[in-house]
C-alpha cells in the first residue's frame, strides 16, 4: 500500500536569466527510493539513481545542475521554461510517486514564490 506523500515547492516564479531550485520531498513512508526522474511535460530532464548517481539530458546539460539533494537547479531561465515539472520517485516496495511543480518565468523583477503544498 502506498502511504507516502510528496511535498513540493508548489507553484513558483522566477526572473528571466535567473536560477531556481526544483525540490520534492517524499515523506510518510519507509519505502526505499531507488531512482528519481525529473521531467518537463513529456521530456526527461535528469535522472538520479541511488547507485549510479546523476545523469543530465544532453539537451539541458548547460542549464541544469543536479541537486541540492534529489532536487534540480535550473539556470539561465528563459520564458520558454515556464510550465509543469514533475519529480517521479521510483521506490521499493511502494512503487511510483509523482510530484508536480509549476514554474512561471517572469520578464519583470517581480517574482514571488508560491506556497508549499502536498500531493498524496
Amino acid at each position: 500500500m502506498m502511504t507516502g506523500t510528496i511535498e513540493t515547492t508548489g507553484n513558483i516564479s522566477a526572473e528571466k536569466g535567473g536560477s531556481i531550485i526544483l525540490q520534492c520531498h517524499l515523506s510518510s513512508t519507509t519505502a526505499q527510493v531507488t531512482q528519481v526522474n525529473w521531467e518537463q511535460q513529456d521530456q526527461l530532464l535528469a535522472i538520479c539513481n541511488a547507485d549510479l548517481g546523476w545523469h543530465i539530458s544532453p539537451s539541458f546539460k548547460d542549464r541544469v545542475a543536479p541537486g541540492p539533494g534529489l532536487g534540480l537547479t535550473l539556470q539561465s531561465l528563459t520564458v520558454n521554461d515556464t510550465g509543469e515539472y514533475f519529480c517521479i520517485y521510483h521506490t521499493y516496495p511502494d512503487g511510483t510517486y509523482t510530484g508536480r511543480i509549476f514554474l512561471e518565468v517572469l520578464e519583470s523583477s517581480v517574482a514571488e514564490h508560491g506556497a508549499r503544498f502536498q500531493i498524496p
Epitope: 531507488t34 531512482q35 526522474n37 526527461l44 535522472i47 541511488a50 547507485d51 544532453p58 521510483h90 512503487g95
Partner: antibody, heavy 121, light 109 residues
Framework: QVTLKESGPTLVKPTQTLTLTCTFS??????????VGWIRQPPGKALEWLAH???????YYNPALKSRLTITKDTSKNQVVLTMTNMDPVDTATYYC?????????????WGQGTLVTVSS | QAVVTQEPSLTVSPGGTVTLTCRSS?????????ANWVQQKPGQLFRGLIG???NRAPWVPARFSGSLIGDKAALTLSGVQPEDEAEYFC?????????FGGGTKLTVL
C-alpha cells in the same frame, strides 16, 4: 513502434572475428536514457548478457568475455555493432539485441528476433 | 562471476497464483540488483515485464508484480491466465554487469 533486427554471418570459423549489427527503429540512441544491449542463448541453454551501450557512449561488458568484445554505436544509422574476436564452437548461439531504457528501469524492454550464429570449421 | 538460479519449471492452474524466484550465489538480492524479468512465449519475441525490482513495463497487466521475498527476487502472477504460459528469465545487475538466470518454464494446466 519499437523494432530491432540483428544481422551478421550465420557461419563463422573458429578463431575468426564475429561482427553483428543491430538495426533499430522507433527510438534514437541520441535520446537521453536510451541504450542497446546484446544477449546470447546457446542451443538449449540459458541467456547470457554480453554488453550494452548507453546514449552517452557509456559501455559495459560481460567480465568473462570483456577482452573479446567491442560494442559501438552509429547514431545516424540507428545501429549498434558488436564484435567478438577469437570465436570458438562454444560461442554457437542465437544472438539478440534489446533496447534498454534507463528512465523507468525497463532495462531489457524490447528484443529483436535473434540471429543464429554457428561456429564450425 | 555470480550465478543466478531460477526454478526450472512450475505448474499453476488458471486463476491461481504462482511465484517465480531468482536467487543470487553472492548473497541476498537487494534493490541494487535492479531485478529484471523477461518473458518469452513460444514462437514470439522476448519482452521485458519488470525492471528495477518492482517497476512494471507499460504493457504489462497488473496481475504481474515484482518484489523481494526473503533473499530472492520474485515475480508473482495472480489470477493466472492461459496466455501466461511461457518461459520467464530474471536478470540481476552486479555493479557493472548483468547476469541472467536459467529461466523458469511456467505451465498453465
Amino acid at each position: 513502434q519499437v523494432t530491432l533486427k540483428e544481422s551478421g554471418p550465420t557461419l563463422v570459423k573458429p578463431t575468426q572475428t564475429l561482427t553483428l549489427t543491430c538495426t533499430f527503429s522507433g527510438f534514437s540512441l541520441s535520446t537521453f536514457a536510451m541504450g542497446v544491449g546484446w544477449i546470447r542463448q546457446p542451443p538449449g541453454k540459458a541467456l547470457e548478457w554480453l554488453a550494452h551501450i548507453w546514449w552517452d557512449d557509456d559501455k559495459y561488458y560481460n567480465p568473462a568475455l570483456k577482452s573479446r568484445l567491442t560494442i559501438t554505436k552509429d547514431t545516424s544509422k540507428n545501429q549498434v555493432v558488436l564484435t567478438m574476436t577469437n570465436m570458438d564452437p562454444v560461442d554457437t548461439a542465437t544472438y539478440y539485441c534489446a533496447r534498454m531504457d534507463y528512465s523507468y528501469f525497463a532495462w531489457f524492454a524490447y528484443w529483436g528476433q535473434g540471429t543464429l550464429v554457428t561456429v564450425s570449421s | 562471476q555470480a550465478v543466478v538460479t531460477q526454478e526450472p519449471s512450475l505448474t499453476v492452474s488458471p486463476g491461481g497464483t504462482v511465484t517465480l524466484t531468482c536467487r543470487s550465489s553472492t548473497g541476498a538480492v537487494t534493490t541494487s540488483n535492479y531485478a529484471n524479468w523477461v518473458q518469452q512465449k513460444p514462437g514470439q519475441l522476448f519482452r521485458g515485464l519488470i525492471g528495477g525490482t518492482n517497476n512494471r513495463a507499460p504493457w504489462v497487466p497488473a496481475r504481474f508484480s515484482g518484489s523481494l521475498i526473503g533473499d530472492k527476487a520474485a515475480l508473482t502472477l495472480s489470477g493466472v491466465q492461459p496466455e501466461d504460459e511461457a518461459e520467464y528469465f530474471c536478470a540481476l545487475w552486479y555493479s557493472n554487469h548483468w547476469v541472467f538466470g536459467g529461466g523458469t518454464k511456467l505451465t498453465v494446466l
